[in-house]
Interface confidence: low
């Protein structure tokens, strides 16, 4: 399976309802420290506002925020880590009404309420350090 | 813990150069935007300059545009500000600062005098 | 040109109450700006109070709070402390692009 380039970067239009479905593989071990980051902008570009900030830290922590004028907000910590050393996950992100809700292979383990709306959301980006096998958005 | 260390500054004639340093330990450097704010003798702190996380977009603010570049090299947990074109009213202590919501980390600060 | 105002100076007595605010030369301060308060002792950097109106930075005694009062932000200091004498500056966000932060004159607070 060809692999994408990372940072991945794709022009996007969400609502609720609407799905990102990302499958990807840590590029190396835990004990390494990688990190996978997804960003849902409100412009297309890498130093706009955040409506969801999702970033893993393999085999540590997950953290989520949001990004309003070039200002972090509140954070949301997670110490749930469904996701295995070396192994491809697949991270499916959920619009729903009053929240993102976040999947990883097949199962609910996050979420973050909406700050920003949604219609707002112009490009997803994911990056860090992963390899990259699929990104798709469904509405 | 978080550290940032600045070094590089000092005496220089008007008209002159120097290039700041700032050594990044006890975070992830590569997540966060990064900003030089200074601070003039007996005044208040002033924003210089900011560099996003990525390295890729920077700000400055209008009594500096054009004559300070702010990089950095996110392998080195390095911030740099390299000041060209140097006058008295830039005399001050340069800090590197950073933080998700604000300036929440800040160095110890470093000395530039621009006098003849 | 933006100009951020502060009061120069104001004085408290211990376990008393003080409000120091921040305020632009024109127009109001909105939540859009996220004002944010730092305080500075003699011979140190400034330290981080509060973020975005009114949220503090980890480790900050509850005694300050952070508040946008009519067109001004506003901190509050209820019970002062003798350690509470310093600098306090203010800094609004003012938009992407040049002199998107700006500080504050400052305010020294006595605390008599």
């Known amino acids: 399976m060809s692999l994408l380039s990372v940072p991945h970067t794709e022009s996007v239009s969400l609502s609720t309802g609407s799905t990102v479905t990302i499958e990807a593989r840590p590029l190396v071990c835990f004990f390494n420290e990688p990190h996978l980051q997804v960003d849902f902008h409100t412009e297309m570009k890498e130093d706009s506002d955040i409506a969801f900030h999702f970033q893993v830290y393999f085999g540590n922590r997950v953290v989520m925020n949001s990004r309003e004028y070039r200002t972090w907000k509140e954070e949301v910590e997670s110490k749930n880590m469904p996701f295995q050393d070396g192994q491809e996950f697949e991270l499916r992100i959920l619009v729903l009404e009053d929240k993102y809700q976040v999947m990883v292979n097949g199962q609910a383990y996050y979420n973050f309420n909406h700050r920003i709306p949604v219609s707002s959301v112009k490009m997803v980006q994911v990056w860090r350090d992963i390899s990259l096998t699929k990104f798709n958005v469904s509405n | 813990q978080v550290q940032l260390v600045e070094s590089g500054g000092g005496l220089v004639q008007p008209g002159g150069s120097l290039r700041l340093s700032c050594a990044a330990s006890?975070?992830?450097?590569?997540?966060?935007?990064m900003s030089w704010v200074r601070q003039a003798p007996g005044k208040g702190p002033e924003w210089v300059s900011d560099i996003n996380s990525g390295g890729g977009s920077t700000y400055y603010a209008d009594s500096v545009k054009g004559r300070f570049t702010i990089s950095r090299d996110n392998a080195k947990n390095s911030l740099l500000l390299q000041m060209n074109s140097l006058k008295p009213e830039d005399t001050a202590v340069y800090y590197c600062a950073t933080g998700y919501t604000g300036y929440y980390y800040w160095g110890q600060g470093t000395q530039v005098t621009v006098s003849s | 040109q933006t100009v951020v105002t502060q009061e120069p100076s104001l004085s408290v007595s211990p376990g008393g109450t003080v409000t120091l605010t921040c305020g632009l030369s024109?127009?109001?301060?909105?939540?859009?700006?996220?004002p944010a308060w730092y305080q500075q002792t003699p011979g140190q950097a400034p330290r981080a109070l509060i973020y975005s109106i009114n949220s503090r930075h980890s480790g900050v005694p509850d005694r300050f709070s952070g508040s946008i009062s009519g067109n001004k932000a506003a901190l509050t200091i209820t019970g002062a402390q003798a350690e509470d004498e310093a600098d306090y500056y203010c800094?609004?966000?003012?938009?992407?692009?040049?002199?998107?932060?700006?500080f504050g004159g400052g305010t020294h607070l006595t605390v008599l």
């Open positions: 800094t609004l966000y003012m938009g992407t692009g040049s002199n998107n932060v700006v």
């Open positions: 006890g975070f992830t450097f590569g997540n966060y935007d």
């Open positions: 024109s127009g109001s301060v909105t939540s859009s700006n996220y």
